[in-house]
């Protein structure tokens, strides 16, 4: 069985000196110096900054919520699948 843990919204502290939102915005087509669209990879925080976020599980990006969640391996739970069930 796979346990999907709570959704984590990448933090958003939009001050002038720091803005820690990790959420990617939907890209418009085309663009200066753009690669061929076929070769572009959708910007997904799970591939980038959240690549080590889920400890015993798989990171999933929920685009419409602009948030990441962890799909935990069997016997693990918690926001980052870091806790082991005592069964």
């Amino acid at each position: 069985s796979v346990r999907v843990e709570q959704v984590v919204k990448p933090p958003q502290n939009k001050t002038e000196s720091e803005n820690t939102s990790d959420k990617p915005k939907r890209k418009k087509k085309g663009g200066k110096n753009g690669k061929n669209r076929r070769n572009r990879k959708k910007k997904n925080p799970c591939n980038a900054e959240f690549q080590n976020f889920c400890i015993h599980g798989e990171c999933k990006y929920i685009e419409h919520l602009e948030a990441v969640t962890c799909k935990c391996q069997q016997e693990y739970f918690g926001e980052r699948c870091g806790e082991k069930s005592m069964k």
């Epitope: 820690t20 939102s21 990790d22 200066k32 753009g34 572009r40 990879k41 900054e49 690549q51 889920c54």
Partner: antibody, heavy 120, light 108 residues
Framework: EVQLQQSGAELVKPGASVKLSCTAS????????MHWVKQRPEQGLEWIGR????????KYDPKFQGKATITADTSSNTADLHLSSLTSEDTAVYYC?????????????WGAGTTVTVSS | QIVLTQSPAILSASPGEKVTMTCRAG?????IHWYQQKPGSSPKPWIY???NLASGVPARFSGSGSGTSYSLTISRVEAEDAATYYC???????????FGAGTKLELK
């Protein structure tokens, strides 16, 4: 060809500010995260922070908070690093790097670096 | 923020020798990336996602590891491999990027 072209060396006085530029060619910076890395003479690599040019969101290592400001201009495909209140500790080579890749992203392209020397 | 500890700091090897350098994370991570840097040059991507060789990297290099322990191995060292190798990872929430202090490979 995918490249990052960095601005030239800077000699600045203590207390001053400086702006370093990194211009991308061969790709659109909106599709990546642009990072800045510091390397002091004979030392290792230190992550300063990054910008997501698509929404201009930034993230910094806490030790560079207030010292560094990263901005991006998607029309010129450029990411800039602003350093303020410079001291001798800021004398270093500053690299811009692109975070990109396949399923797991890493720094696949680096600029040649900009040397900043802080001296009176 | 998870600290990355690289060892040894300096590695001295003869051409043809097999060498291994390690990178230890303060707590479990999924992926480590390695970069090679030669004096006066910018770092180059070398091994990504623990075990994948970046473009142009010779097959004598390999990467492995999991959890908190990762390594870069050169099966037969060549003169051109003399450089400093840095490991890198993302950790924590919000995620922060960290580099190891580097392992300098010197040839005898």
């Amino acid at each position: 060809e995918v490249q990052l072209q960095q601005s030239g060396a800077e000699l600045v006085k203590p207390g001053a500010s400086v702006k370093l530029s990194c211009t991308a060619s061969g790709f659109n910076i909106k599709d990546t995260y642009m990072h800045w890395v510091k390397q002091r003479p004979e030392q290792g690599l230190e992550w300063i922070g990054r910008i997501d040019p698509a929404n201009r969101s930034t993230k910094y290592d806490p030790k560079f908070q207030g010292k560094a400001t990263i901005t991006a201009d998607t029309s010129s495909n450029t990411a800039d690093l602003h350093l303020s209140s410079l001291t001798s500790e800021d004398t270093a080579v500053y690299y811009c790097a692109r975070l990109y890749g396949d399923s797991v992203w890493y720094f696949d392209v680096w600029g040649a670096g900009t040397t900043v020397t802080v001296s009176s | 923020q998870i600290v990355l500890t690289q060892s040894p700091a300096i590695l001295s090897a003869s051409p043809g020798e097999k060498v291994t350098m390690t990178c230890r994370a303060g707590s479990s991570v999924n992926y480590i990336h390695w970069y090679q840097q030669k004096p006066g040059s910018s770092p180059k991507p070398w091994i990504y996602a623990t075990s994948n060789l970046a473009s142009g990297v010779p097959a004598r290099f390999s990467g492995s590891g999991s959890g908190t322990s990762y390594s870069l191995t050169i099966s037969r060292v060549e003169a051109e491999d003399a450089a400093t190798y840095y490991c890198q990872q993302w950790s924590g929430y919000p995620p922060m990027l960290t580099f190891g202090a580097g392992t300098k490979l010197e040839l005898k």
